[in-house]
């Protein structure tokens, strides 16, 4: 790497992937292994992120960009840049400090992450329950009872209500 020629700041000409080495008369030196600089003119190289444990490498570190991680199967990313991995649960469950727990009656979770949310209250919108909710699915709201006058398009009545199984919290 040639010595920089800038009269203002000799480090300003050091390209990404290098650093301005004060110990070597401000020569542009390549970033050492496991480090990078994403912009020019840097006086130090950043440390590459390591994707280990529950993290796995989505993009390798290079001399000009940091590594990117995602999570191993059974875990999902939390936060921008996948700063943490959180254990997956099944649909119909939520993650607590004691592990995955079934959603309480009246709540559901249709994903492998996140918390159990209350079923929609159809009556608030003046509608009726068309399909009952489960641990995994929200209720489906149908037309309001007034809309179901004789002669109107028939709606197959829902199956008898059955409380989804749930374990005590």
């Amino acid at each position: 790497f040639e010595r920089t020629r800038s009269l203002q700041d000799p480090c300003s000409n050091c390209p990404a992937g290098t650093f301005c080495d004060n110990n070597r008369n401000q020569i542009c030196s390549p970033c050492p292994p496991n480090s990078f600089s994403s912009a020019g003119g840097q006086r130090t190289c950043d440390i590459c992120r390591q994707c280990k444990g529950v993290f796995r490498t989505r993009k390798e570190c290079s001399s000009t960009s940091n590594a990117e991680c995602d999570c191993t199967p059974g875990f999902h990313c939390l936060g921008a840049g996948c700063s943490m991995c959180e254990q997956d649960c099944k649909q119909g469950q939520e993650l607590t400090k004691k592990g995955c727990k079934d959603c309480c009656f009246g709540t559901f979770n249709d994903q492998k992450r996140g918390i159990c949310r209350p079923w929609t209250n159809c009556s608030l919108d003046g509608k009726s329950v068309l399909v009952n909710g489960t641990k995994e699915r929200d209720v489906v709201c149908g037309p309001s009872p007034a809309d179901l006058s004789p002669g109107a398009s028939s709606v197959t009545p829902p199956a008898p209500a059955r409380e989804p199984g749930h374990s005590p919290q």
Epitope: N34, S35, S38, A39, G41, Q42, T44, C45, D46, I47, C48, R49, Q50, K52, G53, N66, L78, G79, A80, G81, S83, M84
Partner: antibody, heavy 118, light 112 residues
Amino acid sequence: SLEEAGGDLVKPGASLTLTCTASGFSFTSSYYMCWVRQAPGKGLEWIACIYTGSSGSTYYANWAKGRFTISKTSSTTVTLQMTSLTAADTATYFCARDSSSYYMFNLWGQGTLVTVSS
Amino acid sequence: ALVMTQTPASVSAAVGGTVTINCQASEDIDNYLAWYQQKPGQPPKLLIFYASDLASGVPSRFSGSGSGTQFTLTISGVQCDDAATYYCQGGYYTSSTDTRGAFGGGTEVVVK
């Protein structure tokens, strides 16, 4: 580079906000920006970090929870709010940058001195 | 909480000699360990990261080793400029409620 500001002489029980300003880079590249302090003649003590990505996740040493608050206030500024200060909080407060996710700080500010005395 | 125990608290070495500083973590931190050099009136300077990787601009006479709970910083061919206090630091981000990050107590290196 990183530059800390806001250090001052304050009385016990007072509050103070320190500012760390980045130059030559911005938080558009995601880093962990952290605060570390050093009491006169003593060792280094980690206080808190904030992830500058959109999640803005914050992390605190157990002893710092409740009394210290770290925030990202712009694309180049991080603050540390300190409340109920005591003489034990007298220290030089450093701002530091981590790109590794493992508390390895390759860039430090020069520090700002906070003195708590009546 | 993670605790980093550094030994010795102080060590003296002749120019050209070798200095070894040890750091013990209270729990397994894999290779998530850094070493810093600090001189009076200055901020710390990163020397070693991931237990054994040399930071940019750091002379090769500095080296690090270890993993798990036991780590070592070695300065081979000590120079006068190496007189400083050295700190180890270990840790990792888990969650906001369970975060591990700690510095060792420091080792003062005196060069004769």
